[in-house]
């Protein structure tokens, strides 16, 4: 996307970021938790393989910054990363950013409430030292470490509610939807690809809504 322009293409698009393909397409060999996106993905097989590793080379991000993250918790972070790297259905929520490592990000993706709830439930006894994982880390070693004086505590201490986790963790990349999985109105982090990708319908719905809103704004602007 042209950095000076807002996106007009909201469907079946890849974000302009560090590891994304420029164009979505089939990826037969997507690894493990990223395999639901095989039929149409913005990530490569090697990206999908790498993101399953602890402190992967993709971002040098260490999930275990406060001791070993419980596997039941870690799988949600892997799935979150698969959605981020692989989904071609997040176009309606792509925003331009001026960051050294990416030109675009997602903002306020409506995450299905059960996916957020389960994420929180599976993680709230693991430990972390920060409530926003985008910024404020000590990167002097090349890997994220807790900044001086930031204490490791349970997730529940830093994220007292599911919304605090899903919305605060990545600076509002997600917002918790009131809608449920299967409603066609919220993005599922987890899905069974045998039934197709439910997020395609969700993207179509919000893209259409944005199109209508944009038309109304234009109409409104014309009259004032």
């Amino acid at each position: 996307a042209d950095p000076g322009q807002d996106r007009t293409d909201l469907l079946n698009v890849c974000m302009d970021a560090k590891h994304h393909k420029t164009k979505p397409g089939p990826e037969d060999k997507l690894h493990d938790q990223c395999s639901p996106w095989k039929k149409n993905a913005c990530c490569t097989a090697s990206t999908s393989q790498e993101l399953h590793k602890d402190t992967s080379r993709l971002y040098n991000f260490n999930w275990d910054h406060c001791g070993k993250m419980e596997p039941a918790c870690k799988r949600h972070f892997i799935q979150d990363t698969c959605l981020y790297e692989c989904s071609p259905n997040l176009g309606p929520w792509i925003q331009q950013v001026n960051q050294s490592w990416r030109k675009e990000r997602f903002l306020d993706v409506p995450l299905c409430k059960e996916d957020c709830q389960r994420w929180w439930e599976d993680c709230h006894t693991s430990h972390t030292c920060k409530s926003n994982w985008h910024r404020g880390w000590d990167w002097t070693s090349g890997v994220n470490k807790c900044p001086a004086g930031a204490l490791c505590r349970t997730f529940e201490s830093y994220f007292p509610t599911p919304a605090a986790l899903c919305e605060g963790l990545w600076s509002h990349s997600y917002k918790v939807s009131n809608y449920s999985r299967g409603s066609g109105r919220c993005i599922q982090m987890w899905f069974d690809s045998a039934q197709g990708n439910p997020n395609e319908e969700v993207a179509r719905f919000y893209a259409a809504a944005m199109h209508v809103n944009a038309g109304e704004m234009l109409h409104h602007h014309h009259h004032h």
Epitope: H124, G149, C152, R153, S157
Partner: antibody
């Protein structure tokens, strides 16, 4: 495996000071807060204070303010609790405990008996 | 005030359910944590936060809270559960911690 190992029993005279150590292993010492709790014979647990092992910041119970000092040596992964102006009612078992969530102490030292007697 | 109040003693028949309570103003805005202490031993955390059990703690232990009261419930009490139980809580003002007076649990039978 996380372990907190405390120094041995002490007998002190009234008016003296005592310094109890708590050596941590099995985790990153500077990433967690360490609290000190005491228990007089047959009595309830009593919170004394805590230290942020990362930056050294401390908070003390008002009851012990001015008499207690909690410090740490990060190179030795050890926390210390010093109590001064001892009196007989300070006779107690003193525990260090790791904090995982604002007063949730998941690991405790084995305890150090301090006896104050003339 | 920052006091936490517990009943001094509670008894339960073997295999029955018992509830130990902890009351205090700090519990309106903070969760209670629960510790089991046996004679001559250090306390052991059994419930913390919303209702979390550390690994190794049997699932017969559970926690709940309402208003200014927190409860520890033992469903199907065992002889090994006979001990003193203490609650504690963060006092938000000043990040202090306060303990309850402890409840001596006796398992009968």
């Amino acid at each position: 495996e996380v372990q907190l190992v405390q120094s041995g029993a002490e007998v002190k005279k009234p008016g003296a000071s005592v310094k109890v150590s708590c050596k941590a292993s099995g985790y990153t010492f500077t990433s967690y807060a360490m609290h000190w709790v005491r228990q007089a014979p047959g009595q309830r647990l009593e919170w004394m204070g805590w230290i942020n092992a990362g930056n050294g910041n401390t908070k003390y119970s008002q009851k012990f303010q001015g008499r207690v000092t909690i410090t740490r040596d990060t190179s030795a992964s050890t926390a210390y609790m010093e109590l001064s102006s001892l009196r007989s009612e300070d006779t107690a078992v003193y525990y260090c405990a790791r904090d995982i969530s604002y007063g949730s102490f998941d690991y405790w030292g084995q305890g150090t008996l301090v006896t104050v007697s003339s | 005030s920052s006091e936490l109040t517990q009943d001094p003693a509670v008894s339960v028949a073997l295999g029955q359910t018992v509830r130990i309570t902890c009351q205090g103003d700090s519990l309106r805005s903070n969760y209670a944590n629960w510790y089991q202490q046996k004679p001559g031993q250090a306390p052991v955390l059994v419930i913390y936060g919303q209702n979390n059990r550390p690994s190794g703690i049997p699932d017969r232990f559970s926690g709940s809270s309402s208003g200014n009261t927190a409860s520890l419930t033992i469903t199907g009490a065992q002889a090994a559960d006979e001990a003193d139980y203490y609650c504690d809580s963060r006092v938000s003002t000043g990040n202090h911690v306060v303990f309850g007076g402890g409840t001596k649990l006796t398992v009968l039978g």
